[in-house]
């Protein structure tokens, strides 16, 4: 006999990384029928929502209408169908960023490179802090984690035309509050006709959506969780 | 934005009854889900019971479960918090809170989740 319920899927929309003094709404989504959905920040009780007409609704949001450091964290969500509780979702980290200072990135030998060449990333922020956090835009969450008193080095090591994009870099002051973004560096490998043309790149977004941190994911993996990229969330961890 | 106004603290004695209201400016309060904590002296604040914005949804701490309830008129902008079976250990500042949640069966428990606060009123339980 089955004793729990399958567990539910939890995201964030517009992202998991949200600027501070913006909002964010956490999405779980369970099954129909459900009667009751808990939000748990941290391990404890968060918010409820008994959704009705519980056979017609098979997904909760809840809305988080300014980000700030005591909200960022781990969230997880629960649903219920009777007396039947699901097991738990993945746990979600919510991360505030836009926090204090702003980190400077450079690219050495420079951001023209050729196939093969081996590309170190520089992180540097002056202030109190000893993570650092490197990300290239696109679809996937490529997150690389460092570490230095006030700069931390990213070898890429030979790079390949699949290396192309656009990166940015965050100082964290704790694994749920992040710095300001850097200032973009566009990383162009060029190599012979044949590989960069068939080279896949991730696609990247225009520079104005930066500020709703859609740098990580496509809508449409966002809303299909079986295709979820839990790379960046997992480093967290 | 919304003001919260909470009254009818009080001295009571083991046993009784007290209701308290709170008031909300605006025009908007059936957007609000809302909220009742109390602080006892020497304690963290802590959750006692929820409203959706609609009345539909209710949820209580367990250690007033059954003897407290919560309801709200959203034509007076008012929420309420009807306190039975009152004991020493009730005794703490009141405080209402507001929040504007996405959905109308929604209610937070955690006092981070909460946008707008009262000044609270005070319950005394003892003889």
């Known amino acids: 006999q089955q004793q729990t319920l399958p567990k539910p899927f939890i995201w964030a929309e517009p992202h998991f990384m949200v600027p501070k003094e913006k909002q964010v709404t956490i999405c779980c989504q369970g099954n129909y029928g459900a009667v009751e959905y808990q939000l748990h920040f941290e391990g404890s009780l968060f918010a409820v929502d008994r959704p009705k007409p519980p056979e017609r609704i098979n997904k909760v949001q809840f809305y988080i209408p300014d980000m700030n450091s005591r909200m960022a964290g781990q969230y997880s969500c629960i649903y219920r169908v009777g007396e039947l509780w699901s097991e738990p979702s993945n746990l979600l980290d919510l991360v505030v960023t836009e926090m204090y200072d702003t980190p400077t990135l450079s690219v050495h030998p420079g951001p023209e490179v050729i196939s093969g060449e081996k590309v170190t990333f520089y992180c540097r922020l002056d202030t109190a802090t000893s993570m650092f956090l490197l990300l290239k835009e696109g679809r996937s969450s490529h997150v690389q984690r460092g570490y230095g008193k006030v700069q931390a080095e990213f070898p890429l090591g030979p790079v390949t035309t699949a290396h192309r994009g656009t990166y940015r870099c965050f100082g964290s002051y704790n694994n749920h509050a992040w710095s300001f973004p850097s200032e973009p560096v566009k990383l162009l490998v060029t190599g012979d006709i044949e590989n960069t043309s068939l080279a896949p790149e991730d696609p990247t977004f225009p520079a104005d959506t930066w500020g709703t941190y859609l740098l990580t994911t496509e809508t449409g993996l966002q809303k299909d969780h079986a295709l979820w990229d839990h790379t960046a969330q997992n480093l967290l961890r | 934005q919304v003001q919260l106004v909470e009254s009818g603290g009080g001295l009571v004695q083991p046993g009784g009854s007290l209701r308290l209201a709170c008031a909300a400016s605006g025009r908007t309060f059936s957007t609000y889900a809302m909220g009742w904590f109390r602080q006892a002296p020497g304690k963290e604040r802590e959750f006692v019971a929820a409203?959706?914005?609609?009345?539909?949804?209710?949820y209580y701490a367990d250690s007033v479960k059954g003897r407290f309830t919560i309801s709200r008129d959203n034509a007076k902008n008012t929420v309420y918090l009807q306190m039975n079976s009152l004991k020493p250990e009730d005794t703490a500042v009141y405080y209402c809170?507001?929040?504007?949640?996405?959905?109308?069966?929604?209610?937070?428990?955690?006092?981070?989740?909460?946008?707008?606060w009262g000044q609270g009123t005070l319950v005394t339980v003892s003889s």
């Open positions: 409203i959706s914005r609609n009345g539909g949804t209710t």
């Open positions: 809170a507001a929040s504007r949640p996405l959905s109308n069966t929604q209610v937070g428990v955690a006092s981070a989740w909460y946008e707008f």
